[in-house]
C-alpha cells in the first residue's frame, strides 16, 4: 500500500544511502505484497509452496540483533540476485496462465534491478567486497506443468516478500547503530 516511490537522492552520507536503500526495499515490498495477493486471488494457493532453487530465508541464519552491515548487504544482494533470476525465469517459462500477470512481473523485475543497483552503489561507497554467490547456481528448467508454474510463482513471491521484510528490518536496525 501507499504511493509509488520517487527517485532516491544520491549522497555520500551512509545514513542517507541506507535510507535510500530502505525506501526502495519498502517500495518493492509493497509491490510484491500486491502481486502475491493478485496471485492468490487468481490462483488460490493450497498451503505453503517451496522451490529448492530459492535461497534459504536469511532470517533463519541468526537473530537480526547480531547482524553487521557488511553481512546484511552481502546476503541481501546475493539473495535478491537469485530472486531476480527466478522472476526472469517466471516471465520466460511461466506459460499462458501467468501471461496475465506479465505487466506486474515486468514492473517487479525493474524494481528489483533498481534495488540491486542501489545496493551495489551502497556497497562500493562503503568499500565492501561485491561478493559472488557462495552456492552453485542451480539451472532452472521449465515447470513440469501449468500448475507447477503457478506453484513456483507463489513460492517466489512469498519468499521475496519475507526476504524484503528481513531486509527492511535489518537495514533500519543497522541505521540506528551508524
Amino acid at each position: 500500500p501507499g504511493p509509488p516511490a520517487g527517485s532516491p537522492r544520491v549522497s555520500s552520507d551512509p545514513r542517507a544511502d541506507l535510507d535510500s536503500a530502505v525506501l526502495l526495499t519498502r517500495s518493492l515490498l509493497a509491490d510484491t505484497r500486491q502481486l502475491a495477493a493478485q496471485m492468490r486471488d487468481k490462483f488460490p494457493a493450497d498451503g505453503d509452496h517451496s522451490l529448492d532453487s530459492l535461497p534459504t530465508l536469511a532470517m533463519s541464519a541468526g537473530t537480526l540483533g547480531s547482524l553487521q552491515l557488511p553481512g546484511v548487504l552481502t546476503r541481501l544482494r546475493v539473495d535478491l540476485m537469485s530472486y531476480l533470476r527466478h522472476v526472469q525465469w517466471l516471465r520466460r517459462a511461466g506459460g499462458p496462465s501467468l501471461k496475465t500477470l506479465e505487466p506486474e512481473l515486468g514492473a517487479l523485475q525493474a524494481r528489483l534491478e533498481r534495488l540491486l543497483r542501489r545496493l551495489q552503489l551502497l556497497m562500493s561507497r562503503l568499500a565492501l567486497p561485491q561478493a559472488a554467490p557462495d552456492q552453485p547456481v542451480i539451472p532452472l528448467g521449465p515447470p513440469a506443468s501449468a500448475w507447477g508454474s503457478i506453484r513456483a510463482a507463489h513460492a517466489i513471491l512469498g519468499g521475496l516478500h519475507l526476504t524484503l521484510d528481513w531486509a527492511v528490518r535489518g537495514l533500519l536496525l543497522l541505521k540506528t547503530r551508524l
Epitope: 525506501l23 526495499t25 505484497r33 537480526l64 547480531s66 519475507l162
Partner: antibody, heavy 119, light 111 residues
Framework: EVQLVQSGAEVKKPGASVKISCKAS????????MDWVKQAPGQRLEWIGD????????IYNQKFTGRATLTVDKSASTAYMELSSLRSEDTAVYYC????????????WGQGTTVTVSS | DIVLTQSPASLALSPGERATLSCRAS??????????IHWYQQKPGQAPRLLIY???NLESGVPARFSGSGSGTDFTLTISSLEEEDFATYYC?????????FGQGTKLEIK
C-alpha cells in the same frame, strides 16, 4: 474474522517475570509481523519490538532490549512476550498487534493484558 | 528517536462539527512520496484501532468522514462531521525509522 486473543491479567512481584500469549486466527499467521506495544497509565504508547513468525530473530526497542523476549509458536499461531526483572514502572496494559511487513502500522490489535507489578 | 507532539491535548466539540487534530514530528517522516505516519482511535478500556495508514490511506471499514493529510513534519487528522462514536483519544504514530513512536494523544470530548 481476523482476531488476536491475549492471555489474562497478571499480578507479579518486583524482580519476577511475566509471559503473555497472543493467539492469532482468521489470517495466515506468517503473512504479518507480530508487534508488542506497552501502554502505562498516563504515558504514551510504547513499541516494545516485533517478530516475523516465519522465523529468525525479533527486533526490539533499545529501551526493552535484554528484558523483553519475543517468541512464536508457528504451529499454534501464537506469539509470546516475556518481560523479566519486573519493576513497578512495568505496570501497564500490553498489547499484541498485527504489523504490516516493512511498514510498522498495526491494523489488528489484541484486547490487551494488564500486568500489575506490586510488592 | 523521533518525537511526535500532538495538539491540542484535548478538544471539546459538538456532534456535526469538524475536528482537526495535529501531529508534529521532531524530524521529517516523509521520503520520496511516502509519509510514514499512521493514526489510531482509542476508547476507554479498548485497544487502539487503526484509522489512517501512510498519512492519507483510509483503513478498510473506517468511515469516509476520517481523512489524513500532511508531509514532512506536519500532519493532520480531520473528521469532517463528528458523530457520537467519534469521541475518543486519537494517537499518531510514525514508522520512518526504528523504533516506531507514538504521540501523546489528543482527547476529543463532547461539548
Amino acid at each position: 474474522e481476523v482476531q488476536l486473543v491475549q492471555s489474562g491479567a497478571e499480578v507479579k512481584k518486583p524482580g519476577a517475570s511475566v509471559k503473555i500469549s497472543c493467539k492469532a486466527s482468521g489470517y495466515t499467521f506468517t503473512d504479518y509481523n507480530m508487534d508488542w506495544v506497552k501502554q502505562a497509565p498516563g504515558q504514551r504508547l510504547e513499541w516494545i519490538g516485533d517478530i516475523n513468525p516465519h522465523g529468525g530473530g525479533p527486533i526490539y526497542n533499545q529501551k526493552f532490549t535484554g528484558r523483553a523476549t519475543l517468541t512464536v509458536d508457528k504451529s499454534a499461531s501464537t506469539a509470546y512476550m516475556e518481560l523479566s526483572s519486573l519493576r513497578s514502572e512495568d505496570t501497564a496494559v500490553y498489547y499484541c498487534a498485527r504489523g504490516e511487513l516493512g511498514h510498522w502500522y498495526f491494523d489488528v490489535w489484541g484486547q490487551g493484558t494488564t500486568v500489575t507489578v506490586s510488592s | 528517536d523521533i518525537v511526535l507532539t500532538q495538539s491540542p491535548a484535548s478538544l471539546a466539540l459538538s456532534p456535526g462539527e469538524r475536528a482537526t487534530l495535529s501531529c508534529r514530528a521532531s524530524k521529517s517522516v516523509s521520503t520520496s512520496g511516502y509519509s510514514y505516519i499512521h493514526w489510531y482511535q482509542q476508547k476507554p478500556g479498548q485497544a487502539p484501532r487503526l484509522l489512517i495508514y501512510l498519512a492519507s490511506n483510509l483503513e478498510s471499514g473506517v468511515p469516509a468522514r476520517f481523512s489524513g493529510s500532511g508531509s514532512g513534519t506536519d500532519f493532520t487528522l480531520t473528521i469532517s462531521s463528528l458523530e457520537e462514536e467519534d469521541f475518543a483519544t486519537y494517537y499518531c504514530q510514525h514508522s520512518r525509522d526504528l523504533p516506531p513512536t507514538f504521540g501523546q494523544g489528543t482527547k476529543l470530548e463532547i461539548k
